[in-house]
């Protein structure tokens, strides 16, 4: 059993449940955003393909002191099989493009919703 959901989860859950909860957390962030998210911090854009959960975490983990995305960071760690630390990058990053965290979250949310609708939970 995989403890998907990381520290945000009360215990092991099915992949579909973990993905559902991640989507809801991202919806939460986009709905509750008033001031610029994470003070307008910029992060590396990623390829929304295989391995994107680790890539998303590698990108977002470099944003510090932003409580709004801390839960998302913890949840993403549950989807990534290896430990991710700040400054770590994989080949999945589009290293020539930086975007605002708010846009990164919106793009990720749209893609995850698509995966969920299509039944791609793993």
């Amino acid at each position: 059993l995989t403890c998907l959901g990381g520290f945000a989860s009360p215990g092991p859950v099915p992949p579909s449940t973990a993905l559902r909860e991640l989507i809801e957390e991202l919806v939460n962030i986009t709905q509750n955003q008033k001031a610029p998210l994470c003070n307008g911090s910029m992060v590396w854009s990623i390829n929304l393909t295989a391995g994107m959960y680790c890539a998303a975490l590698e990108s977002l983990i470099n944003v510090s002191g932003c409580s709004a995305i801390e839960k998302t960071q913890r949840m993403l760690s549950g989807f990534c099989p290896h430990k991710v630390s700040a400054g770590q990058f994989s080949s999945l990053h589009v290293r020539d493009t930086k975007i605002e965290v708010a846009q990164f979250v919106k793009d990720l949310l749209l893609h995850l919703k698509k995966l969920f609708r299509e039944g791609q939970f793993n």
Epitope: V13, P14, S16, T17, E24, V27, F121
Partner: antibody, heavy 118, light 107 residues
Framework: EVQLQESGPGLVKPSETLSLTCTVS????????WNWIRKPPGKKLEYMGY???????YYNPSLKSQITISRDTSKNQLSLKLSSVTAADTAVYYC????????????WGQGTTVTVSS | DIQMNQSPSSLSASVGDRVTITCHAS??????LSWYQQKPGKLPKLLIY???DLHTGVPSRFSGSGSGTDFTLTISSLQPEDFATYYC?????????FGGGTKVEIK
């Protein structure tokens, strides 16, 4: 104690829109997931979809073009709309709660019978 | 979609009997299975989740087992209030799907 109560017309004409309401008491629809499930006569229970505490929705792909789930937070109600109904949509319709981080339905409504017939 | 097949579709038993109902998933669902009980004209009630965890307030005569594709609901000593229809449901992936039900009748 959270309780769910479905309501709506018991008879709907073919090609019309079926509209049902689920009233939640003892809890808030701004927490957890609120689902619609139906049981056609002689068939299996069929999962229809949910509306989340955020208002986000998921629909069973088999019903995607037909179904809309919405909510009214001021009335603590969720609603189901099913367009262009046929006799195959005749069923007992249930609303049910699914808590965050779970995949099972811990609270159900009594169900309401809807017959599609002219 | 994951198909859930329950057997038998109905059974007759007496008070005190040990009753076993099985549920088969068309693919591996790990332990993400729940069981429900429904009496005529009543709402479905959650009995068991995660294949073997008893929901709050459910009598200990009910038990669940299994993982992967094959699961069992057992009533160790059937009581008069247990005559009902029982359903399994998978929570591995959306859309969630149910078994066809097993009606437990009085012999």
């Amino acid at each position: 104690e959270v309780q769910l109560q479905e309501s709506g017309p018991g008879l709907v004409k073919p090609s019309e829109t079926l509209s049902l309401t689920c009233t939640v008491s003892g809890g808030s629809i701004t927490s957890d997931y609120w689902n619609w499930i139906r049981k056609p006569p002689g068939k299996k229970l069929e999962y229809m979809g949910y509306i989340s505490y955020n208002g986000n929705t998921y629909y069973n792909p088999s019903l995607k073009s037909q179904i809309t789930i919405s909510r009214d937070t001021s009335k603590n109600q969720l609603s189901l709309k099913l367009s262009s109904v046929t006799a195959a949509d005749t069923a007992v319709y249930y609303c049910a709660r699914l808590a965050k981080w779970t995949w099972y339905f811990d609270i159900w409504g009594q169900g309401t019978t809807v017959t599609v017939s002219s | 979609d994951i198909q859930m097949n329950q057997s038998p579709s109905s059974l007759s038993a007496s008070v005190g009997d040990r009753v076993t109902i099985t549920c088969h998933a068309s693919q591996n669902i790990n332990v993400w299975l729940s069981w429900y009980q429904q009496k005529p004209g009543k709402l479905p009630k959650l009995l068991i989740y995660k294949a073997s965890d008893l929901h709050t307030g459910v009598p200990s005569r009910f038990s669940g087992s299994g993982s992967g594709t094959d699961f069992t609901l057992t009533i160790s000593s059937l009581q008069p209030e247990d005559f009902a229809t029982y359903y399994c449901q998978q929570g591995q992936s959306y859309p969630y799907t149910f078994g066809g039900g097993t009606k437990v009748e009085i012999k």
